[in-house]
Amino acid sequence: ATKLTEEKYELKEGQTLDVKCDYTLEKFASSQKAWQIIRDGEMPKTLACTERPSKNSHPVQVGRIILEDYHDHGLLRVRMVNLQVEDSGLYQCVIYQPPKEPHMLFDRIRLVVTKGFSGTPGSNENSTQNVYKIPPTTTKALCPLYTSPRTVTQAPPKSTADVSTPDSEINLTNVTDIIRVPVFN
């Protein structure tokens, strides 16, 4: 099995994790994709997934997780808004391709959320963003029931993450609905 690497991201409560997972668009554009958490001693658990087949650039929101699959670019964007300390953990993007096992990323995201004032929700001082609106979408997709194995032999997508941080206009549409829904069971 290929050894998986991980990258550590330290964010503050209220900020937004923004992960970009690259994939080969000719192969996987319409494939269903998912965002998973990996807890110690457990199989990866799917927290949110795109529709099947995945719709181009159509946001899917599950609680505070928003997925956007850009077929034209071969890029799955995953955002976790209004981060909480309990969101800390190990995450990954996967591509479902039944009946085969899901493709997983080599670079997993080690998210560490700490307490501390971060300005307005989802912001900090390093922003280059001037408009940020959490979409009011409530679209949800049914995710496959099976979980992914730990071993990996191939991983076409690649992922990175950054803090999405507004600095002037903030319009948190339906934010109360978003932050009330827990990410985890």
């Epitope: 690259d22 850009y70 034209d72 670019h73 071969g74 890029l75 922003s127 408009v131 992922s159 803090v163």
Partner: antibody, heavy 116, light 107 residues
């Protein structure tokens, strides 16, 4: 075939304004992030600004914040860059590009010259 | 801001030879790294994204590798049409930043 055609470039004095436009065709404009990237004569590439499909997210490079405004009209498949308070260092070829993070398709560019 | 540094600034290679271009990031960009080719008087063209995924229509002689802070673009056997300037670009964090470019010229 993806086509991006820029217009609106020209010679302007320091402190002046210009509005660049980009006509897009050959793809679903309303489903794509769009950006502007510039290239000063004989120099490398510099990202300027990006805008999401519905304009709910907009990003600028620090050097143009407060002076440039990126906008789009999905009904007309057009992208715009309003440039105010222009400086000599804004002189460049401005490219309209498809994508918000990396850039799959590029126009041929329009030259903006800021000089007195 | 993540600073991207490319080396060498100029690479002199004979047709048919292998060319290896380097790109270094000032901090990790994981795999969110793209490579572009630009010929004189033309707009840039996307070659590689995700550090190693070839863009649509790009010949197999172009390959990318690396992760984190060190990346490489390899052209296995240079064709006459490959002599151009090559740029790397990170898209992990805003602001998006490009390297200064590597000019691949005929030896």
């Amino acid at each position: 075939e993806v086509q991006l055609v820029e217009s609106g470039g020209g010679l302007v004095q320091p402190g002046g304004s210009l509005r660049l436009s980009c006509a897009a065709s050959g793809f679903t404009f309303s489903s794509n992030w769009m950006s502007w990237v510039r290239q000063a004569p004989g120099k490398g590439l510099d990202w300027v600004a990006s805008i999401k499909q519905d304009a709910s997210e907009i990003y600028y490079v620090e050097s143009v914040k407060g002076r440039f405004t990126i906008s789009r009209d999905n009904a007309k498949n057009s992208l715009h860059l309003q440039m105010n308070s222009l400086r000599a260092e804004d002189t460049a070829v401005y490219y309209c590009v498809r994508g918000g993070w990396r850039f799959e398709s590029w126009g041929q560019g329009t030259l903006v010259t800021v000089s007195s | 801001e993540i600073v991207m540094t490319q080396s060498p600034a100029t690479l002199s290679v004979s047709p048919g030879e292998r060319a290896t271009l380097s790109c270094r990031a000032s901090q990790s960009v994981s795999s969110n790294l793209a490579w572009y080719q630009q010929k004189p008087g033309q707009a840039p063209r996307l070659l590689i994204y995700g550090a190693s995924i070839r863009a649509t229509g790009i010949p197999a002689r172009f390959s990318g590798s690396g992760s984190g802070t060190e990346f490489t673009l390899t052209i296995s056997s240079l064709q006459s049409e490959d002599f151009a300037v090559y740029y790397c670009q990170q898209y992990k964090n805003w602001p998006l930043t490009f390297g200064g470019g590597t000019k691949v010229e005929i030896k």
